[in-house]
């Protein structure tokens, strides 16, 4: 990468070399020949998160309570407030700008992963021997009920929307 | 007491590489830039870059760009200088040099050097 | 690039004399300049910086001066351990840069 004029944390600026802003302050004025450079802390819901020379600070993001969302981690004036959603919902986008509805696994199938505030219900098909028979975001797949270890007999099989049917052994000989 | 302590003299073809070593003692390595200065024989003294111990980041002057490559070991306090390609007019005793404070400097790039290593000989020769 | 030029490039001087040797930038780097000894075979040593400020465990008969771009190195009542190379160097921006060098002889 090409040369440069200034040591890390400092940028050029009428051929002399100022101290950038630290995290959470702006700066005010470039530094002169005589004079450091002027920075100011950030205000209320504000921030800057890196060393800078910004004449203006960030807004903090607002947890739109509209969209579903709310405050995952407060601000600082060092870093941004993250958003996460609601209970029941998951956010749209990394930025989690706004939420939606966690999914839920439709009968035959069974919640592999349940959802969290960034990540939507992940759903896997009942295997042969499991079965769901709800339309769930927390269920999983159910293992058949095993006949045999109730002394009973399969009357009607599983589907992996269906439990078997179990009932009592013929006696007719 | 402050201490930098450098390999000894090389003795190297043309095309070749050569990588000097430089460990410090006697202070914090990570809190001051490590710079690399060469002085060809008979000659003045020739500003070759510098590395943050701290980041690694990394800054050669123009004549070097492309063949040099500064690097540390902050495990071992100790700051390299790898110079590719050599050419005969590569002789020279290669110094490093230990920087002001980080966070000292407030409106230049006060780049005084305090403590020399007692510098590598590095012949390129045919 | 900021171009160093120091004059003259060599000097002869008795012990107990006064000598000055000048450094001219190529443009403003007020405050930012050093001054280096240098004695055959040994690394440099930092003598003065920011113009003006004597390192640590310098004698005071060494003396830095100048602004803008015109500096100079005062060694008063020269003592036989001064008689080495002096170069410049400034420390406004990168690349650094180094004067030529004014080698002190004994006359």
């Known amino acids: 990468e090409p040369p440069t004029a200034c040591r890390e944390k400092q940028y050029l600026i009428n051929s002399q070399c100022c101290s950038l802003c630290q995290p959470g302050q702006k700066l005010v004025s470039d530094c002169t020949e005589f004079t450091e450079t002027e920075c100011l802390p950030c205000g209320e819901s504000e921030f800057l998160d890196t060393w800078n020379r910004e004449t203006h600070c960030h807004q903090h993001k607002y947890c739109d309570p509209n969209l579903g969302l709310r405050v995952q981690q407060k601000g600082t004036s060092e870093t941004d407030t993250i958003c996460t959603c609601e209970e029941g919902w998951h956010c749209t986008s990394e930025a989690c700008e706004s939420c939606v509805l966690h999914r839920s696994c439709s009968p035959g199938f069974g919640v592999k992963q349940i959802a969290t505030g960034v990540s939507d219900t992940i759903c896997e098909p009942c295997p042969v021997g499991f079965f769901s028979n709800v339309s769930s975001a927390f269920e999983k797949c159910h293992p058949w009920t095993s006949c045999e270890t109730k002394d009973l007999v399969v009357q009607q099989a599983g589907t992996n929307k269906t439990d078997v049917v179990c009932g009592p052994q013929d006696r007719l000989r | 007491q402050v201490q930098l302590v450098q390999s000894g003299a090389e003795v190297k073809k043309p095309g070749a590489s050569v990588k000097v070593s430089c460990k410090a003692s006697g202070y914090t390595f990570t809190g001051y830039y490590m710079h690399w200065v060469r002085q060809a024989p008979g000659q003045g003294l020739e500003w070759m870059g510098w590395i943050n111990p701290d980041s690694g980041g990394t800054n050669y002057a123009q004549k070097f760009q492309g063949r040099v490559t500064m690097t540390r070991d902050t495990s071992i306090s100790t700051a390299y200088m790898e110079l590719n390609r050599l050419r005969s007019d590569d002789t020279a005793v290669y110094y490093c040099a230990r920087d002001q404070p980080l966070g000292y400097c407030t409106n230049g790039v006060c780049s005084y050097f305090d403590y020399w290593g007692q510098g590598t000989l590095v012949t390129v020769s045919s | 690039d900021i171009q160093m030029t120091q004059s003259p490039s060599s000097v002869s001087a008795s012990v107990g004399d006064r000598v000055t040797i000048t450094c001219r930038a190529t443009?403003?780097?007020?405050?930012?300049l050093a001054w280096y000894q240098q004695r055959p075979g040994k690394a440099p040593q930092l003598l003065i910086y920011r113009t003006s400020t004597l390192q640590s465990g310098v004698p005071s008969r060494f003396s830095g001066s100048g602004s803008g771009t015109d500096f100079t190195l005062t060694i008063s009542n020269l003592q036989p351990e001064d008689f080495a190379t002096y170069y410049c160097?400034?420390?406004?921006?990168?690349?650094?840069?180094f004067g030529q060098g004014t080698r002190l002889e004994i006359k």
């Open positions: 160097q400034h420390a406004k921006i990168f690349p650094i840069t």
């Open positions: 443009q403003d780097i007020r405050p930012w």
